[in-house]
Interface confidence: low
């Protein structure tokens, strides 16, 4: 069987400490443009809703979190950048402040594993393409193994 | 607050019993190959090796799940059926069954969570679309909130 | 200091009932999947329950299915078995227990409760 | 379900020795275990879990290693405190725990 490869958790055992740091470093960011932003917001509803937090708090938090970053830096802040220039270089500020977070996160598998891909999987798509007719047969021959893999993948998601 | 939509989880409370007849079914429909595929495969090496195991049973498993059943369905047995119509027929039902579990894994959220999107999210594109610039505004004036949302989600992971 | 304190034990007959609750300080109940297991001198260690964190899903092994019932409340931070159509092979000390976060293993183990059925 | 086997059953050492308990597992659950210890009248209490992570708070001296069906328990050097049952526990398809091996002083 081939070697495990390393997972490269680089960073995962300090991470609680460097966590409060990024988090405190995004909240003092913000506090930069915050004034700007409250004055400018008219509307008493609520956009980022009790939902949103339960989705961070349940089994697509990972989603939620990806996707809400890419949400912020792709579709909010370009927007926003456009009150001037003082503005401008806060938002950046804050921009590359999100980018380091999700940077850290993502090195540190288990706080982003929806953005990783799988290495065995890579690795067994390199070797079928290796194998070319051989790898259709082999594949083929293997699907019982696929299914042990099915199988404790739901054992594990039934306990969880 | 919007109130909660509903996680649409059916399926979910009496999946475990469903499970063991959908893999079973699996089986079933595999062993009509089976043999045909064994005769073929020359080769000594093992394709699905138990480092595709541990990816399964890790954090990456939902990744190595969803990649694996498209790697079958797309590039394995299209290529497999073309060993006649007797062969084809069976790939055609064991491939419905792979869709089938698919279907069901992906109903039920948390058995197939990075194939979800999160509602939550959904939701606040949506809104912020329709407020046009006042949701640039809102979503700013709301980075607390998401920040809040980032330490809720980190300490869940930290606590895991 | 995680505390798991189970009562409600005692002697009953067979077909009788009985509840199990289980009080848990030290830690934020609502975090952990919650679990019961039972050892007896000729079966050894089983488990028996286990309740998810928010009390979503249930589980049970199978001699036990459709008479035991496990819940919680949260808010009380206390897990309760409910045990009935009880049999002579019921007979063993129950444990309340912790699943450490999204793992599996058991963690930390209250004292026990003795459960007799015999006639 | 997944059968479990613990050997010996009974060990009897002297202070100071290095013990060895072994657990075998009837499939491959890769490290998907845990290690106990259960002293008299009291409940059991996690030493070991994933096969080598040692619970915080358990002494150095305890160990463990093994992989797949075959895993192994290690005390370097038995202290009295250390006579007890222990069972191994394997949480990768269902829960089933081992019969235990009943450590005792010579």
């Known amino acids: 069987s081939r070697g495990q490869y390393s997972r490269e958790d680089n960073n995962c055992t300090h991470f609680p400490v460097g966590q409060s740091h990024m988090l405190l470093e995004l909240r003092t960011a913000f506090s930069q443009v915050k004034t700007f932003f409250q004055t400018k917001d008219q509307l008493d509803n609520i956009l980022l809703t009790d939902s949103l937090m339960q989705d961070f708090k349940g089994y697509l938090g990972c989603q939620a979190l990806s996707e809400m970053i890419q949400f912020y830096l792709v579709e909010v802040m370009p927007q926003a950048e456009k009150h001037g220039p003082e503005i401008k270089e806060h938002l950046n500020s804050l921009g590359e402040k999100l980018k380091t977070l999700r940077m850290r996160l993502r090195r540190c598998h288990r706080f982003l594993p929806c953005e990783n891909k799988s290495k065995a999987v890579e690795q067994v798509k390199s070797d079928f393409n290796k194998l070319q007719d051989q790898g259709v047969y082999k594949a083929m021959n293997e699907f019982d193994i696929f299914i042990n893999c099915i199988e404790a993948y739901m054992m594990i998601k039934m306990k969880s | 607050s919007r109130g909660q939509y509903s996680r649409e989880d059916n399926n979910c409370t009496h999946f475990p019993v469903g499970q063991s007849h959908m893999l079973l079914e699996l089986r079933t429909a595999f062993s009509q190959v089976k043999t045909f595929f064994q005769t073929k495969d020359q080769l000594d090496n093992i394709l699905l090796t138990d480092s595709l195991m541990q990816d399964f049973k890790g954090y990456l498993g939902c990744q190595a799940l969803s990649e694996m059943i498209q790697f079958y369905l797309v590039e394995v047995m299209p290529q497999a059926e073309k060993h006649g119509p007797e062969i084809k027929e069976h790939l055609n039902s064991l491939g419905e069954k792979l869709k089938t579990l698919r279907m069901r894994l992906r109903r039920c959220h948390r058995f197939l969570p990075c194939e979800n999107k999160s509602k939550a999210v959904e939701q606040v594109k949506s809104d912020f679309n329709k407020l046009q610039d006042q949701g640039v505004y809102k979503a700013m004036n709301e980075f607390d909130i998401f920040i809040n949302c980032i330490e809720a989600y980190m300490m869940i992971k930290m606590k895991s | 200091e995680v505390q798991l304190v189970e009562s409600g034990g005692g002697l009953v007959r067979p077909g009788g009932s009985l509840r199990l609750s289980c009080t848990a300080s030290?830690?934020?109940?609502?975090?952990?999947?919650m679990a019961w297991v039972r050892q007896s001198p000729d079966k050894g260690l089983e488990w028996v329950a286990s309740?998810?964190?928010?009390?979503?899903?249930?589980y049970y092994r199978d001699s036990v299915r459709g008479r035991f019932t496990i819940s919680r409340n949260n808010a009380k931070t206390t897990l309760y078995l409910q045990m009935d159509s009880l049999r002579s092979e019921d007979t063993a000390t129950f444990y309340c227990?912790?699943?450490?976060?999204?793992?599996?293993?058991?963690?930390?183990w209250g004292q026990g409760v003795m459960v007799t059925v015999s006639s | 379900d997944i059968q479990m086997t613990q050997s010996p059953s009974l060990l009897s050492a002297s202070v100071g020795d290095r013990v060895t308990l072994n657990c075998k597992t009837s499939?491959?659950?890769?490290?998907?275990l845990a290690w106990y210890q259960q002293k008299l009248r009291e409940p059991p209490k996690l030493l070991i879990f994933?096969?080598?992570p040692l619970q915080a708070g358990i002494p150095s001296r305890f160990s463990g290693s093994g992989s797949g069906t075959d895993f192994t328990l290690t005390i370097t050097s038995l202290q009295p405190e250390d006579v007890a049952t222990y069972f191994c526990?394997?949480?990768?398809?269902?829960?089933?725990f081992g019969p235990g091996t009943k450590l005792e002083l010579k």
């Open positions: 227990t912790r699943h450490r976060g999204f793992s599996v293993w058991l963690d930390y």
């Open positions: 030290g830690f934020t109940f609502s975090d952990y999947h």
């Open positions: 309740i998810t964190l928010d009390a979503t899903y249930t």
């Open positions: 499939q491959n659950i890769f490290e998907n």
């Open positions: 994933n096969a080598s």
């Open positions: 526990h394997q949480y990768y398809s269902g829960y089933t």
